[in-house]
């Protein structure tokens, strides 16, 4: 086809942005290009072309008319992680191609299984008590809090320190006795550990 004066090569006018998305949630990587004739858009991840519903109608990835890449749900397993990675969109027409900036798609996850559940503890009044848990693996790394008898633990109490997965009570009172649960939280949600009982004995 011969070059028409009004034709021009593609240029990216909206670049995709980095995303962090929860597993199972929808997501969109934006891309908009100009050019005449209207450029075709393809997406690449780690140098490999990304399959969309244009290739396989069952695909969970859709190429939108705008050129954006829409994920019906972010797919992310224990081993296979087909959606995570660094993406670029490429706009092409007969005059050339334009490549977007890199955009990383990270998947936020929070597994179900605590790596370490807290254990029952028995102490005498006035003695220190320590409970320890390791929350499920997660990204971003889950923060840890504790509940006592179903309510958030009062960490303003100067006797109580929460550091890493450790709950430390410097000197126990009878009122500290109860059922404790470790809670791991990130943007995906929260997970609760198994219950551990703190028993405080009279001296």
């Amino acid at each position: 086809s011969r070059l028409r004066q009004e034709d021009f090569p593609p240029r990216i006018v909206e670049h995709p942005s980095d995303l962090i998305v929860s597993k199972g949630e929808p997501a969109t990587l934006n891309c908009k290009a100009e050019g005449r004739p209207t450029p075709t858009i393809e997406w690449y991840k780690g140098g490999e072309r990304v399959e969309t519903d244009k290739d396989d109608p069952r695909s969970h990835r859709m190429l939108l008319p705008s050129g954006s890449l829409f994920f019906l749900r972010i797919v992310h397993g224990r081993r296979s992680k087909p959606d995570e990675g660094v993406y670029v969109c490429v706009a092409r027409n007969y005059l050339g191609e334009a490549v977007s900036h890199n955009a990383s798609l990270e998947v936020a996850i929070l597994r179900d299984d605590f790596r370490q559940n807290p254990s029952d503890v028995m102490v005498a009044v006035g003695e220190p008590a320590v409970m320890e848990c390791q929350p499920p693996r997660g990204h971003p790394e889950p923060t840890i809090s504790w509940k006592k008898d179903g309510s958030p633990l009062d960490d303003k109490d100067e006797r109580i320190t929460i550091r890493g997965g450790k709950l430390m009570i410097t000197y126990t009172r009878k009122s500290d006795a109860g059922k404790y649960v470790c809670v791991g939280t990130n943007m995906v949600g929260e997970r609760e550990s198994e219950v551990a009982e703190l028993t405080v004995l009279e001296r």
Partner: antibody, heavy 118, light 105 residues
Framework: EVQLVQSGAEVKKPGASVKVSCKAS????????MHWVRQAPGQGLEWMGW????????NFPQKFQGRVTMTRDTSITTAYMDLSRLRSDDTAVYYC???????????WGQGTMVTVSS | DIVMTQSPSSLSASVGDRVTITCRAS??????LNWYQQKPGKAPKLLIY???SLQYGVPSRFSGSGSGTDFTLTISSLQPEDFATYYC???????FGGGTKVEIK
Amino acid sequence: EVQLVQSGAEVKKPGASVKVSCKASGYTFTGYYMHWVRQAPGQGLEWMGWINPKSGATNFPQKFQGRVTMTRDTSITTAYMDLSRLRSDDTAVYYCARESGDDAFDIWGQGTMVTVSS
Amino acid sequence: DIVMTQSPSSLSASVGDRVTITCRASQKISSYLNWYQQKPGKAPKLLIYAASSLQYGVPSRFSGSGSGTDFTLTISSLQPEDFATYYCQQSVGLFFGGGTKVEIK
């Protein structure tokens, strides 16, 4: 269309090795782990291990360690399973299977019959 | 290794019957459990993943339930094409159960 196409049937002598191939098409080869599963005649499914096509890392259950090798060639989107020191009880249909991001084997090859007989 | 125990190993049923197959894990596996159907001479086919999610294209008469150590596959109304062998698989260590053969009564 997403599919896995395996190499043809093999007949081997005890002590020999066999290499089965699995050609992937219709998806991003490096995005999904590939597994190998075998099934002896009239028996159940036995998982043999996985390969991460992106890195080449592998993992096998104790039973197959030292006897199985899994490799891949990303340029031709093909995974390979090599089983050495064959015995008669290795006679089975060998399947490759893609592990989805939902932790399940969603796409399977058609199977390769390997017969070990003297 | 986590051992998967399926029961029964075989069962006889008629078209239209409700069929239940159970799978027990030797330790807790959360919802990391899949179910497959296999017909003679064919590769297995994924039915259910993550204990209860129906794979694309699988008829809704198949359902899965359970969490932790005990899991169930239910076929609400058995169809002629459902006579096959069914396998559970835990997706932590990837081992399969021994299979359940569903035969015509």
